[in-house]
Amino acid sequence: PSLIKQQVLKNVRIDPSSLSFNMWKEIPIPFYLSVYFFDVMNPSEILKGEKPQVRERGPYVYREFRHKSNITFNNNDTVSFLEYRTFQFQPSKSHGSESDYIVMPNILVLGAAVMMENKPMTLKLIMTLAFTTLGERAFMNRTVGEIMWGYKDPLVNLINKYFPGMFPFKDKFGLFAELNNSDSGLFTVFTGVQNISRIHLVDKWNGLSKVDFWHSDQCNMINGTSGQMWPPFMTPESSLEFYSPEACRSMKLMYKESGVFEGIPTYRFVAPKTLFANGSIYPPNEGFCPCLESGIQNVSTCRFSAPLFLSHPHFLNADPVLAEAVTGLHPNQEAHSLFLDIHPVTGIPMNCSVKLQLSLYMKSVAGIGQTGKIEPVVLPLLWFAESGAMEGETLHTFYTQLVLMPKVMHY
């Protein structure tokens, strides 16, 4: 066992001479992003104050390619890198095409309306006039490709004029536009060469030891890894913590059960019920507030102030009133919960599916004519599953090196 331990320690650290270095640099696991849209069935009725009705469409599946670049080894046992992602649509795995039309809330109009609720009435009336002139409505009919990767919208120019410096988009707006062909920030993580106990843990993200999106030191902490590998020799008492640039926060998953993936022993980690709980139910989350119902997290502070919320798909594990407020939602543990299956000896993921939902809080706002009589509601826009499983040659090598060899050595 000590020989095995030495082999593991030698081969998991971030070091060009280690076995897992290339695996860390260019993840050989095929990752897929499966996106499900909530097609709004009754936009006119919602504007009259009726309950929203949605229909899930999808999945629209993309192969996700990741590669690390600008890899720089520092002299404090850390390495800095940028990880780029590109997405390629997979028609054969998808239920529909990127040219499918989806009726969706107009995030720019409805987001701007909520953001301007407490602004002077004059500004709101100017916005109404502008929205009318520009033909901007509360709901839009756009293709999957446009929603994902961006569409030209004159409202982007208008928002940049009236709210300068707040909006990360120029000319085009798309929900996943910032992810494609771009990096998720400069990560600096510990290599484990000098101190294996800190391996993969994030030292800094974009040069920061903590973020400032939230209202408490605890919520602003950058904890855990960058979300791809974890320290070795896990136990059922271990937790799986990582910093997510997309959620602008650290997340902690808990051990659920032991299992086997393709002959390799694994630990399954899942989201605790408290992950998106509000501050009154789980006080440590108070720093993520102001909160609405429990089970959704306000990400407006890191998403250009738009009233966007993150949760489990279909408001799974959230306050039931959220799913009841929208016809067509059916939360289901099997279909909508996230998991990561980790090989506990190495801390390397074997099989994972991270599922999250993005929703928009919308309501009628006095002075913004386009909001009609919309009753306050958190309306799901889409949910996605980012999934990957080790396979092929990589799996074979992994099984041989880390399951078969130790067994042989043991005997």
């Epitope: 009336l125 109404t128 006039l129 520009l134 409505r137 709901f139 120019n157 208008l158």
Partner: antibody, heavy 119, light 108 residues
Framework: EVQLVQSGAEVRKPGTAVKISCKVA????????IYWLQQAPGKGPEWMGL????????IYAEKFQGRVAITADTSTDTAYMELSSLKSEDTAVYYC????????????WGQGTLVTVSS | VLTQPPSASGAPGQRVTFSCSGS????????VNWYQQLPGAAPRLLMH???QRASGVPDRFSGSKSGTSASLAITGLQSEDEADYFC???????????FGGGTKLTVL
């Protein structure tokens, strides 16, 4: 479907004021913002101001600021536009218009009211 | 603020194009609407968001934009198309919509 019905033609002397009405029919008055536009002979329309009848909030174009007052009477489903200190160049057709909720642009217009300013 | 030629003409069945010239604070940054005004009538929304036909408008009408200019095209010209055509856009510097002076179309 919403319709806008305006009051009849008016003749005024310079320096006086005129008040035009615009009645909303076919739908709930307070669901619609009402816009007022001026169209001088041989010219394109010019936006003057708007009102949200729900709470009588208004904004006006800089050109007409101080001379125009837009009001709404929810008991009669009617919006009004009053233009004061009239000059001969105010001779024009005045339109009320709206955008039916969920539509784009000014897609519903009143029939127009001709105001002639002459001494 | 938006400049349109005062007149245009075409024979029935022909194609006619109207131009509308603006600046970076209006057409250059935002979408364009087109209105049709028949003699003695109120303007009627014809095209919105540059290239989208308003409800009930036949597909003989089409709109486009390039840089700080926009255009409206009518194919298969008909006598009932004889009217004034106005372009409109949001203007940044005026915080309001601006209209062109209009182009009078005569069907020969």
């Amino acid at each position: 479907e919403v319709q806008l019905v305006q009051s009849g033609a008016e003749v005024r002397k310079p320096g006086t004021a005129v008040k035009i009405s615009c009645k909303v029919a076919g739908d709930t008055f307070t669901d619609y913002f009402i816009y007022w536009l001026q169209q001088a002979p041989g010219k394109g329309p010019e936006w003057m101001g708007l009102i949200d009848p729900k709470d009588a909030q208004t904004i006006y174009a800089e050109k007409f600021q101080g001379r125009v007052a837009i009001t709404a009477d929810t008991s009669t489903d009617t919006a009004y536009m009053e233009l004061s200190s009239l000059k001969s160049e105010d001779t024009a057709v005045y339109y009320c218009a709206t955008d039916s909720v969920g539509s784009a642009g000014f897609d519903v217009w009143g029939q127009g009211t001709l105001v002639t300013v002459s001494s | 603020v938006l400049t349109q030629p005062p007149s245009a003409s075409g024979a029935p069945g022909q194609r006619v194009t109207f131009s509308c010239s603006g600046s970076g604070s209006n057409i250059g940054s935002y979408t364009v609407n087109w209105y049709q005004q028949l003699p003695g009538a109120a303007p009627r929304l014809l095209m919105h968001t540059t290239d989208q036909r308003a409800s009930g408008v036949p597909d003989r009408f089409s709109g486009s934009k390039s840089g700080t200019s926009a255009s409206l095209a009518i194919t298969g010209l008909q006598s009932e198309d004889e009217a004034d055509y106005f372009c409109a856009a949001w203007d940044d510097s005026l915080d309001g919509p601006v209209f062109g002076g209009g182009t009078k179309l005569t069907v020969l």
